[in-house]
């Protein structure tokens, strides 16, 4: 049975040009993570494996940074990058737990962080 | 059982255009990123296409950019390879090939199909 | 592009002996450096991803190191069905590039 909950950074807004730190954090359970995805609507941007370290796709490798800790973080941001981001949780035994952020990069400096939000 | 196979190669002239595919099973083909991968004739690999799982973006080398274009079906499985303006260095053995979901290597690769281009 | 140099071309060894496969790159690439068999008239065969972990079902006598620029495959007891062409790939940028290839035939 499944009983962890991901809590995220919920919704957040950046502006253009900076930097942004996308963060999951798996609670509720004692399963072991063995891996965490991060992912951009259809691309898969980094992993994050336990034994293993970071990988970053070839896609994103200018433009993403790993951590801190199971975090990402994203850098240059342009509008473009406006959008859903989920943090895939690969457990053992519990299985796969999804965390969802989701992004606006503003044009302007009136970019502010939303309210922290569970999934359970 | 992971299962990929190729089709749709043959004997295409210089600047012809030929249209490969990739029909899977075995797994679900919507939670993938998939490659196409060629080799010459007794040469080495060469990496020719990437997709996204969703087929939303995709990545090319140089040497095949405007030229190929890869694109897939979820609901059909299937992966493609549009080949336009083929040129003899073209010809090879074209593998479709599945990424780990891992990693960003490929676990799984069809048989190949062939692909000569001469006239 | 990142280049990926193979040596030796061909390593000639007999069975039950030790092989070591050398790749180098010609830039970091981290540990985003994977090994491939192949085997005549076959599609390649993932051994090897993120420099040192086996893939599923891989023998233990595989096995690899490095990080950088400089990459080993190493077989500690060649059996007969090890026999083959192998193949390092890096996936630390685009375009993704594998290396020449190093035959690994019998002695």
């Known amino acids: 049975m499944m009983t962890g909950t991901i809590e995220t950074t919920g919704n957040i807004s950046a502006e253009k040009g900076g930097s942004i730190i996308l963060q999951c954090h798996l609670s509720s359970t004692t399963a072991q993570v063995t891996q965490v995805n991060w992912e951009q609507q259809d691309q898969l941007l980094a992993i994050c494996n336990a034994d293993l370290g970071w990988h970053i796709s070839p896609s994103f490798k200018d433009r993403v940074a790993p951590g801190p800790g199971l975090g990402l973080t994203l850098q240059s941001l342009t509008v473009n990058d406006t959008g859903e981001y989920f943090c895939i949780y690969h457990t053992y035994p519990d299985g796969t737990y999804t965390g969802r952020i989701f992004l606006e990069v503003l044009e302007s400096s009136v970019a502010e962080h939303g309210a922290r939000f569970q999934i359970p | 059982e992971v299962q990929l196979v190729e089709s749709g190669g043959g004997l295409v002239q210089p600047g012809g255009s030929l249209r490969l595919s990739c029909a899977t099973s075995?797994?679900?083909?919507?939670?993938?990123?998939m490659y196409w991968v060629r080799q010459a004739p007794g040469k080495g690999l060469e990496w020719v296409a990437y997709i996204t799982k969703g087929g939303g973006s995709t990545y090319y080398p140089d040497s095949v950019k405007g030229r190929f274009t890869i694109s897939r079906d979820n609901a059909k499985n299937t992966l493609y390879l549009q080949m336009n303006s083929l040129r003899a260095e073209d010809t090879a053995v074209y593998y479709c090939?599945?990424?780990?979901?891992?990693?960003?290597?490929?676990?799984?690769w069809g048989q190949g199909t062939l692909v000569t281009v001469s006239s | 592009e990142i280049v990926m140099t193979q040596s030796p071309a061909t390593l000639s060894v007999s069975p039950g002996e030790r092989a070591t496969l050398s790749c180098k790159a010609s830039q970091d690439v981290g540990t985003s450096v994977a090994w491939y068999q192949q085997k005549p008239g076959q599609a390649p065969r993932l051994l090897i991803y993120?420099?040192?972990a086996r893939h599923t079902g891989v023998p233990a006598r595989f096995s690899g190191s490095g990080s950088g620029t400089e990459f080993t495959l190493t077989i500690s007891s060649l059996q007969s069905e090890d026999f083959a062409v192998y193949y390092c790939?890096?996936?630390?940028?685009?375009?993704?590039?594998f290396g020449g290839g190093t035959k690994v035939e019998i002695k």
């Open positions: 075995g797994f679900t083909f919507s939670d993938y990123y």
């Open positions: 993120w420099a040192s």
């Open positions: 090939a599945r990424q780990t979901n891992y990693d960003f290597t490929m676990d799984y």
């Open positions: 790939q890096q996936y630390s940028s685009y375009p993704l590039t």
